[in-house]
Amino acid sequence: KFSKQSWGLENEALIVRCPRQGKSSYIVDWYYSQTNKSIPTQERNRVFASGQLLKFLPAEVADSGIYTCIVRSPTFNRTGYANVTIYKKQPDCNVPDYLMYSTVSGSEKNSKIYCPTIDLYNWTAPLEWFKNCQALQGSRYKAHKSFLVIDNVMTDDAGDYTCKFIHNENGANYSVTATRSFTVKDEQGFSLFPVIRAPAHNETKEVEIGENTNLTCSACFGKGAQFLATVQWQLNGNKITDFSEPRIQQEEGQNQSFSNGLACVNTVLRIADVKEEDLLLRYDCLALNLHGLRRHTIRLSRK
């Protein structure tokens, strides 16, 4: 299934894009997957479809579920799925992992924090920014367009940053928040040429046809916060995003720190419903930092 995960908070606006690529003006129909009931396009409804976009104004926990979008044309239709989860607002300041967008890293030279998903909304500047739930104040913080710039970044600037903005739809305003972690390059730390812990180079993994399997790419880059440290999978030398096989999905890298202080990153490649053709692909685990690139290759074989 060609699907995409989206999440939001109750009583906030959530806008989801159909995962099937299409241009503006294409005809897109949306349905509740469970009931096959069409989602209305009239803007007076709390949940309505607007071309490529599905709008929850505002979202409710009960909206959680899978939504089907069909890019229609007179001779050829394309179907995608949006997996939407709406969470209750947290009573305390803690933002759980499942509400976090991808982590960004910064340094004294580069401290931009982009507000996730904001491009989907009709918003006007300025954004409000919070760190660990406290409103950011002072001349060091500059809200610029859709990102936050921090001057003279220090290690204690690391933390969870939330952007808050107002989405306007036909004169009505809806709040939206999005949170992501910001890490700061630790001057006391150091970085090394990447070391891939798993998989071993030229490893072969046995899999069952029709089953699901996970491949973990795990690499370490040195001690302390790393300015650039990415771990990703490639298929036959292509990025996963370029390959666009919906059964094969790469999770965002998870940062890990070991007792010896090593900064490591794990990225999991999930392969659903393993097919014969997957056995012919070359799976490359790539670890990249400022020192260079290391690659370990793994192949799949039938059990």
């Epitope: 241009k23 294409y26 044309s73 001779t75 239709n77 370029d242 390959f243 666009s244 096989e245």
Partner: antibody, heavy 117, light 111 residues
Framework: EVQLQESGPGLVKPSQSLSLTCTVT?????????WNWIRQFPGSKLEWMGF???????SFNPSLKSRISVTRDTSKNQFFLQLNSVTTEDTATYYC??????????WGQGTTLTVSS | DIVLTQSPASLAISLGQRATISCRAS??????????MFWYQQKPGQPPKLLIY???NLESGVPARFSGSGSGTDFTLNIHPVEEEDAAAYYC?????????FGGGTKLEIK
């Protein structure tokens, strides 16, 4: 980035079958789009021939239906054109192209085919 | 089959002037509020490149001097102001039904 590349024999004798291959890189042909064959005759006229969709469904130009087939090899991310009983009228540049239900977005560079004895 | 007739077959336009190319369909290519007409540019030795989709929408990366209009059976591609690099052949194409067909093409020469 999606890239398509046609390959074929260049020269075919009349009454024989023509087989062309389109190799797609940067995108899986089973994940989206319809994968088409389009030809351009020496006078520049363009003709859509047929497609195979991401799900494996096919559709053909009725003018060619009796002698065309489009198949694929998902393990190699390739799709193929077979045209039977060719005549000199089938001399053309053959393009493969992706189709999103609306327009042909990505095209190969084309391969020239001459039908001659 | 829907026959697309392009006119003129060729035209020569001075730099900075307007080029207008017409495409007429033998039956309507519009349905449910959308016109399934597309325009492509082709330069020698290259495949066609999409310029305009759904009659009037500019494809990403295409200069704003290209514009499309029309509905039903009559469609127009305009280029203004014409530039040196616009010398090429232009084709209309419909996707209203199978078979998809193309117009005969219009060759634009820059004077």
């Amino acid at each position: 980035e999606v890239q398509l590349q046609e390959s074929g024999p260049g020269l075919v004798k009349p009454s024989q079958s023509l087989s062309l291959t389109c190799t797609v890189t940067g995108f899986s042909i089973t994940s989206d789009y319809a994968w088409n064959w389009i030809r351009q005759f020496p006078g520049s006229k363009l003709e859509w021939m047929g497609f195979i969709s991401y799900s494996g469904d096919t559709s053909f130009n009725p003018s060619l239906k009796s002698r065309i087939s489009v198949t694929r090899d998902t393990s190699k991310n390739q799709f193929f054109l077979q045209l039977n009983s060719v005549t000199t009228e089938d001399t053309a540049t053959y393009y493969c192209a992706s189709y999103d239900g609306y327009s042909f977005d990505y095209w190969g560079q084309g391969t020239t085919l001459t039908v001659s004895s | 089959d829907i026959v697309l007739t392009q006119s003129p077959a060729s035209l020569a336009i001075s730099l900075g002037q307007r080029a207008t190319i017409s495409c007429r369909a033998s039956k309507s290519v519009s349905t449910s509020g959308s016109s399934y007409m597309f325009w492509y540019q082709q330069k020698p030795g290259q495949p066609p490149k999409l310029l305009i989709y759904l009659a009037s929408n500019l494809e990403s990366g295409v200069p704003a001097r290209f514009s499309g209009s029309g509905s039903g059976t009559d469609f127009t591609l305009n280029i203004h102001p014409v530039e040196e690099e616009d010398a090429a052949a232009y084709y209309c194409q419909h996707s209203r039904e199978i078979p998809y067909t193309f117009g005969g093409g219009t060759k634009l020469e820059i004077k």
